[in-house]
Interface confidence: medium
């Protein structure tokens, strides 16, 4: 996870006593919530591995950096860190491994200054399409989120909705394209089987986008033309058999992208020419000598940049009468 | 939150080598380029090159190709900057940055002093 | 290489005033640029970036535009911690440039 992590050294702890403990007075500047470490001069707040099962309520109003790692959250409801005064400052946001299982519309809502989301490492089975952009309406206001690290959310089969997952995690996304500044998305290890083709027409301002070790296998129908700005594009260890024509030039076709292939099970038959012959000439591939052939069994551990057409042949289809099993 | 830390000033003779240090925190060392920029006193910012962390990668401004090197530790999140042969005109101030499109944090500089 | 051909290379202002720094690329570079603020003895800060994007926390007088080979810094109502050094910075094509500068002092 890209999320910050403090170099404070003066940490202050508060007593050990409930977390859910609410004063009915305002928080002092100063307080620091129960079961949490602050530092006002790093302006950093660390509740970490707490077993917290809610947010604490009195959060101190400097806190630009905020850990809340290690939890028992389960649910993040509309308003989850509304304060009044308003936390104005907090910048990064860190949720990763707090068992959250749903994250409900609104929950970041009044957060005017959070630029770094991380809810890696969570068993998302119900994020609210509305979950980022705060409202149902068609264009929402502009999130100020620059990063948004959304890495191993997927829930495991048997908490999962009836309905995609992918779908439920892009509609959130695009909800009143309110995320239409966000820089860098990070989706790894999630299961996702495909990408919806109108996912990234929509983030005009990605920079880096990570979608490694997921279980994609094809991106013809993804179009990258859009992403003008992208960076870096981490398609590791994903199920990648070849990249078409249309997208080999889409991808030559962005300024500043470097693309990340490692680990796919590259079948090299007669489709793969095209690649093969790209692959040789671009420098968008970074480690593009270590990709290698997966299948056929007779090219498997070949080197794609050493193959030539005449290692690239698709065995004939033979008429159903002559196939055997 | 995102710091990037720099080694301290050197003084070297012409024809020597001097090599920079750019440690970084507050962030995942291996997702953002890191970029080289000097600034001569009383001058402006001129981009030296890129290397990218994760892949090793760099690119270098023509000006200072063969005799500049950047490379990285991933495991002490450190990047450096290596300049060769150096010439009384390479006296600056030198800043590692973050970010290969434009640069948004910035390590506080290293002053290289070339004098005989 | 493209170049970066900033004006004027310096500027008197007063307090108040309407300030327009220009940049001009030698080649079109769509929007892929930014404006940094250096203060003397100081790290530069970003204050634009993609030509007209204003960063996170820089205050709203400060406004970026153009597009192609023509780009404008505007700082609305010059106040007295903007005094300093402004350069635009191009990242469209490898190498990356920088303009020469654009010293804004007091009147």
């Known amino acids: 996870s890209s999320s910050p992590t403090s170099s404070a050294s003066s940490f202050s702890s508060s007593a050990p006593f409930l977390a859910s403990a609410v004063s009915a007075q305002p928080p002092l500047p100063d307080q620091c919530p129960a079961l949490c470490e602050c530092s006002e001069a790093a302006r950093t707040v660390k509740c970490v591995n707490r077993n917290l099962t809610e947010v604490p309520t009195d959060l101190p109003a400097y806190v630009r950096n905020l850990f809340l790692t290690g939890n028992q959250l389960a649910v993040l409801p509309a308003g989850a860190f509304a304060r009044r005064p308003p936390l104005a400052e907090l910048a990064a946001l860190n949720l990763s491994g707090s068992r959250l299982d749903e994250v409900r519309a609104g929950a970041f809502e009044h957060l005017p200054s959070l630029r770094q989301l991380d809810l890696s490492h969570n068993p998302l089975a119900d994020l609210s399409p509305f979950a980022f952009s705060g409202s149902n309406a068609s264009v929402s206001a502009p999130s100020p989120l620059v990063e948004l690290i959304l890495n191993h959310i997927v829930p495991p089969e048997d908490e999962r909705q009836n309905r995609s997952f992918e779908g439920m995690v892009v509609a959130a996304l695009l909800a009143g394209r309110a995320l239409q500044g966000l820089r860098r998305l990070e989706l790894a290890s999630n299961h996702f089987l495909y990408l919806p083709r109108d996912v990234l027409a929509q983030l005009p301002s990605l920079r880096h986008l990570d979608l490694s070790n997921n279980s994609l296998v094809s991106l013809t129908y993804v179009s990258f033309r859009n992403l003008t700005h992208l960076e870096s594009l981490h398609l590791e260890d994903n199920a990648l058999k070849v990249l078409h024509n249309g997208t080999l030039a889409e991808l030559q076709g962005l300024p500043h992208i470097r693309v990340f292939l490692d680990n796919n099970p590259w079948v090299c038959d007669c489709h793969m020419a095209d690649m093969v012959t790209w692959l040789k000439e671009t420098e968008v591939v970074q480690g593009k000598d270590r990709l290698t052939c997966a299948y056929p069994e007779k090219m498997r551990n070949r080197v794609l940049l050493e193959l030539n057409s005449a290692d690239l042949d698709c065995d004939p289809i033979l008429p159903p009468s002559l196939q055997t099993s | 939150q995102v710091q990037l830390v720099q080694s301290g000033a050197e003084v070297k003779k012409p024809g020597a080598s001097v090599k920079v240090s750019c440690k970084a925190s507050?962030?995942?060392?291996?997702?953002?380029?890191i970029i080289w920029v000097r600034q001569a006193t009383g001058q402006g910012l001129e981009w030296m090159g890129w290397m990218n962390p994760k892949s090793g990668n760099t690119g270098y401004a023509q000006k200072f190709q063969g005799r500049v090197s950047m490379t990285r530790n991933t495991s002490i999140n450190t990047a450096y900057m290596e300049l060769s042969t150096l010439r009384s005109e390479d006296t600056a101030l030198y800043y590692c940055?973050?970010?290969?499109?434009?640069?948004?944090?910035w390590g506080q500089g290293t002053l290289v002093t070339v004098s005989s | 290489d493209i170049q970066m051909t900033q004006s004027p290379s310096s500027l008197s202002a007063s307090v108040g005033d309407r300030v327009t720094i220009t940049c001009r690329a030698s080649q079109g570079i769509r929007n892929d640029l930014a404006w940094f603020q250096q203060k003397p003895g100081k790290t530069p800060k970003r204050l634009i970036y993609d030509a007209s994007n204003l960063q996170s926390g820089v205050p709203s007088r400060f406004s970026g535009s153009g597009s192609g080979t023509e780009f404008t810094l505007t700082i609305r109502s010059l106040q007295p911690e903007d005094f300093a050094t402004y350069y635009c910075?191009?990242?469209?094509?490898?190498?990356?440039?920088f303009g020469q500068g654009t010293k804004v002092e007091i009147k």
């Open positions: 910075l191009q990242y469209n094509r490898y190498p990356r440039t």
């Open positions: 940055a973050r970010g290969g499109l434009e640069p948004d944090y």
């Open positions: 507050g962030y995942t060392f291996t997702t953002y380029d």
